[in-house]
Amino acid sequence: MMTGTIETTGNISAEKGGSIILQCHLSSTTAQVTQVNWEQQDQLLAICNADLGWHISPSFKDRVAPGPGLGLTLQSLTVNDTGEYFCIYHTYPDGTYTGRIFLEVLESSVAEHGARFQIPHHHHHH
């Protein structure tokens, strides 16, 4: 039975040209995290494998930095980076947990950094 939940930063906004940290946290399970995939819609951004380390997609290597931790740092943001991001946790023995983050990249300096909503987003599946 999958008891874990993914906590994410929820909906976040950032300024064009700036950076943002995408972060998820798996809690309420003793399952071992073997790999975390970061995806933007259906496009792979990066993989963090517990044994092999990081794989950053070549298309993003110049503006995606691994970490902190299992998170991902997006740099030199453009308005095209606006959209859904997913952290996909592969675990043993539970299976796969998925968290969702929505990033809005704003033209102006009114972008607020950090979560707009205090309640973390939970979503998991096999």
């Epitope: 073997t34 790999q35 792979l44 993989i47 494998n49 517990a50 092999l52 380390g53 794989h55 290597k61």
Partner: antibody, heavy 119, light 107 residues
């Protein structure tokens, strides 16, 4: 066109070291990780390790960890694999292989370098 | 280490035949499996990654399927240039390991 051109065949004595080079062209060298895989005569494929040419960070197969060192020279877009304390069982073809777009598999391979260990 | 087995270890087939090669893995690797083709004296060539995604330039007669621990590579209509040895490889943990290979030769 992606090309990985490896150095020539080597004959080494037991206990010696060998350093094989792999010159990459046709793509941005620092954007793609590089793997090293070997194949003993008539045998299957054995993964040795991988390196991030951008950071120089590497991961090794535990079997080779004490004997193998993978490095890169970013200026010349060249990866290197050095294997020390050679024994006859290390006689094999050594391949460099570029990591793919979507994970830890290899999408382009060098032509291979034959290393013979013999007294 | 993750163990990989392939069956059959060798097979004889004719041009036009449908060929299926199986790869079994000792633990769940989700869909992180690649297939390679190797001809004598040549380097391996990537055919499939992520279990079912065809690599660039690979003919559509090749297809991959499976997830978890059981995977297959299918050649729908064997061509003369397909006689070779085929290896599966998981791309999920350290060490990356390959199957022992399946040699496809002419009947």
């Amino acid at each position: 066109e992606v090309q990985l051109v490896q150095s020539g065949a080597e004959v080494k004595k037991p206990g010696a070291s060998v350093k094989v080079s792999c010159k990459a062209s046709g793509y941005t060298f620092t954007n793609y990780y590089m793997h090293w895989v070997r194949q003993a005569p008539g045998q299957g494929l054995e993964w040795m390790g991988r390196i991030d040419p951008d950071s120089g960070g590497s991961k090794y197969n535990e079997k080779f960890k004490s004997r193998v060192t993978i490095t890169v020279d970013k200026l010349s877009s060249t990866a290197y694999m050095e294997l020390s304390s050679l024994r006859s069982e290390d006689t094999a073809v050594y391949y460099c292989a570029r990591e793919g777009h979507y994970g830890f598999y290899s999408d382009y391979w060098g032509q291979g370098t034959t290393v013979t260990v013999s007294s | 280490d993750i163990q990989m087995t392939q069956s059959p270890s060798s097979l004889s087939a004719s041009v036009g035949d449908r060929v299926t090669i199986t790869c079994r893995v000792s633990e769940n690797i989700y869909s992180y499996l690649a297939w390679y083709q190797q001809k004598p004296g040549k380097s391996p060539k990537l055919l499939v990654y992520n279990a079912k995604t065809l690599a660039e330039g690979v003919p559509s007669r090749f297809s991959g399927s499976g997830s978890g621990t059981d995977f297959t590579l299918t050649i729908s209509s064997l061509q003369p240039e397909d006689f070779a040895t085929y290896y599966c490889q998981h791309h999920y943990g350290n060490p990356l390991t390959f199957g022992p290979g399946t040699k496809v030769d002419i009947k």
